[in-house]
């Protein structure tokens, strides 16, 4: 089976059940339902999944049975629309049920909430978790899928199956260990952090497809796969891009069974043809399916062929450039992107796409000119500033990170971004700036050749978080402009923003800067978030405050927290010293 199976199936649900097996089928239907109805209780979803599974089994037994010929969207949509509390829980989303397919599914997709109003997941004691795991392993693992899926409605479903497999393995191993907590907690922390990163990466892929279209996603995929598989032929890369686009289009569109099935087919194809693709795939291809697919997605770049010729000859110096471009524009531009990307694993994907866009714009202009060759002869010179801009930015920011460390680097970014877009909500600014700040520890340790792809492509993922959160409640025209004008220029757009001079400072509210003894029991991370929240609020009150003023206030604040957390009567200390701190801060900032 290729990724594009053209063989008709009488029953799509039976086909997918047989391809995926009962366990994966049930898990994927649960993920799909939880990503659509994010507020529904776990038990309700399990009931719906069991009903769908029983129905699928009847179709496997007899594909001609009643309703077995219906599309998966029809079957799943009908099932979701049986939820009794749909109107009360979801409001206008209930109106989706009055629509016919495919409009009904589109309606459900539009109501996916990137920031659902759900309680933070609190991790129980290790013994409590191990007891729950042993008492009912199946329910325990389903609960994991449900809780992640409803909080991350665009999580890459087949990859979530891989996370669940690792989650199960962690409990299986650690609940038997002498020191359960020492074994389990680091593994759960790692899964949580990797899961958040995976969710954010997939969110960018879905945004790329949904907001900028298939061509934008395909261009991204050509660049990335050409860097990863520089020995592969252009047609091989093109085939992988076409198949990968289909997989991600399906997952982003809620077609999770098709997506998982096609992803498995793609992994199979890659492994069967690894000699033509990459020398780095051998280990991945020896793994079981879920591990194999994950491994392929993360595989390191293959070595570049030694004898690659100069690009200038055929893409700039040749008199046939316009003829070749006119013959098949997208193939010619695709080849340009492929050839440039496989030579530049040291560039970010977004930079490669900017270069391709510049090249395309130049050809569009020059091929209509009197002397096309003269016109496009210097096109590669236009690339220089585009390459130098991210290089310089990364150099400066890595120097700043090395000087400050992660926490203070995050604070510098908090101040920078709050001044750029002060209308954005404080929790969003804190979350996004903290993630932007993590670029330092993630990428600055790398040698020069790996810094840009690490940093700029990571920043694209984080800025997309800002874009999707802002889209839900738009408050800043500048954010909207940077998010919607060009996918590849989002980071340069945000970098170029200066202080928003139109912003009217927020009224001072002492309550915002009132702290209590509960801060002392928080983890270091939670305490940092409290301090960073205060910092954002300070900048919103006094956007013209200097770095020195803000540093002085934050140092005083840190000393105040440390002092009161050591006091015998903590609450009294926070009340009395807090008033003094607020007064001193107001004076220091001229509030």
């Amino acid at each position: 089976r290729g990724v594009f199976r053209r063989d008709a199936h009488k029953s799509e649900v039976a086909h997918r059940f047989k391809d995926l097996g009962e366990e994966n089928f049930k898990a994927l239907v649960l993920i799909a339902f939880a990503q659509y109805l994010q507020q529904c209780p776990f038990e309700d979803h399990v009931k719906l999944v069991n009903e769908v599974t029983e129905f699928a089994k009847t179709c496997v037994a007899d594909e001609s049975a009643e309703n077995c010929d219906k599309s998966l969207h029809t079957l799943f949509g009908d099932k979701l629309c049986t939820v009794a509390t749909l109107r009360e829980t979801y409001g206008e989303m209930a109106d989706c049920c009055a629509k016919q397919e495919p409009e009904r599914n589109e309606c459900f997709l539009q109501h996916k909430d990137d920031n659902p109003n759900l309680p933070r997941l609190v991790r129980p004691e290790v013994d409590v978790m191990c007891t729950a795991f042993h008492d009912n392993e199946e329910t325990f693992l389903k609960k994991y899928l449900y809780e992640i899926a409803r909080r991350h409605p665009y999580f890459y479903a087949p990859e979530l199956l891989f996370f669940a497999k690792r989650y199960k393995a962690a409990f299986t191993e650690c609940c038997q260990a002498a020191d359960k907590a020492a074994c389990l907690l680091p593994k759960l922390d790692e899964l949580r952090d990797e899961g958040k990163a995976s969710s954010a990466k997939q969110r960018l892929k879905c945004a790329s497809l949904q907001k900028f279209g298939e061509r934008a996603f395909k261009a991204w995929a050509v660049a990335r796969l050409s860097q990863r598989f520089p020995k592969a032929e252009f047609a091989e890369v093109s085939k992988l891009v076409t198949d990968l686009t289909k997989v991600h289009t399906e997952c982003c569109h809620g077609d999770l069974l098709e997506c998982a099935d096609d992803r498995a087919d793609l992994a199979k194809y890659i492994c069967e043809n690894q000699d033509s693709i990459s020398s780095k795939l051998k280990e991945c291809c020896e793994k079981p399916l879920l591990e194999k697919s994950h491994c392929i997605a993360e595989v390191e770049n293959d070595e570049m062929p030694a004898d690659l010729p100069s690009l200038a000859a055929d893409f700039v110096e040749s008199k046939d450039v316009c003829k070749n471009y006119a013959e098949a524009k997208d193939v010619f531009l695709g080849m340009f992107l492929y050839e440039y990307a496989r030579r530049h694993p040291d560039y970010s994907v977004v930079l490669l796409l900017r270069l391709a866009k510049t090249y395309e714009t130049t050809l569009e202009k020059c091929c209509a000119a009197a002397d096309p060759h003269e016109c496009y002869a210097k096109v590669f010179d236009e690339f220089k500033p585009l390459v130098e801009e991210p290089q310089n930015l990364i150099k400066q920011n890595c120097e700043l990170f090395e000087q400050l460390g992660e926490y203070k680097f995050q604070n510098a970014l908090l101040v920078r971004y709050t001044k750029k877009v002060p209308q954005v909500s404080t929790p969003t600014l804190v979350e996004v700036s903290r993630n932007l700040g993590k670029v330092g520890s993630k990428c600055c340790k790398h040698p020069e050749a790996k810094r840009m792809p690490c940093a700029e492509d990571y920043l694209s993922v984080v800025l997309n978080q800002l874009c999707v959160l802002h889209e839900k409640t738009p408050v800043s025209d500048r954010v909207t402009k940077c998010c919607t004008e060009s996918l590849v220029n989002r980071r340069p757009c945000f970098s170029a923003l200066e202080v928003d001079e139109t912003y009217v400072p927020k009224e001072f509210n002492a309550e915002t800067f009132t702290f209590h003894a509960d801060i002392c029991t928080l983890s270091e991370k939670e305490r940092q978030i409290k301090k960073q929240t205060a910092l954002v609020e300070l900048v919103k009150h006094k956007p013209k405050a200097t770095k020195e003023q803000l540093k002085a206030v934050m140092d005083d604040f840190a000393a105040f927290v440390e002092k009161c957390c050591k006091a015998d009567d903590k609450e009294t200390c926070f009340a009395e010293e807090g008033k003094k701190l607020v007064a001193a801060s107001q004076a220091a900032l001229g509030l």
Epitope: E233, F234, A235, S238, D275, P309, D314, N324, A328, E339
Partner: nanobody, 125 residues
Framework: EVQLLESGGGLVQPGGSLRLSCAAS????????MGWFRQAPGKEREGVSS????????FYTNSVKGRFTISRDNSKNTLYLQMNSLRPEDTAVYYC??????????????????WGQGTLVTVSS
């Protein structure tokens, strides 16, 4: 429509060299991926080497790497295959093929759209 005409085949001793040529005519953009294939008696046709006439990237099957070199002269619309250190197992009919770079894959002859008639290379002492 595209026409391809190979030349340069012949009898050569093991360790010797040959240079094959392939002249292309017609809509040359349709031939911006060009390759050499070979078919030994009783065996399937296999890819030897390919080149993009835009970009100049080259690809070789493992058994000929370091011995064969593909090149092209765009001004003459001609493809070449320089074969050195020839071995008896290189004996085959060598075909020139062309197609779209978005489709052509050296391991799959069906992805090439245009074919020459072939030229015989015999390596024997």
């Amino acid at each position: 429509e595209v026409q391809l005409l190979e030349s340069g085949g012949g009898l050569v001793q093991p360790g010797g060299s040959l240079r094959l040529s392939c002249a292309a005519s017609g809509n040359t953009y349709l031939t911006s991926c060009m390759g050499w294939f070979r078919q030994a008696p009783g065996k399937e046709r296999e890819g030897v080497s390919s080149i993009y006439t835009v970009g100049g990237s080259t690809f070789y099957t493992n058994s000929v790497k370091g011995r064969f070199t593909i090149s092209r002269d765009n001004s003459k619309n001609t493809l070449y295959l320089q074969m050195n250190s020839l071995r008896p197992e290189d004996t085959a009919v060598y075909y020139c093929a062309a197609g779209s770079p978005a489709r052509c894959r050296l391991r799959d002859p069906t992805t090439f759209d245009y074919w020459g008639q072939g030229t015989l290379v015999t390596v024997s002492s």
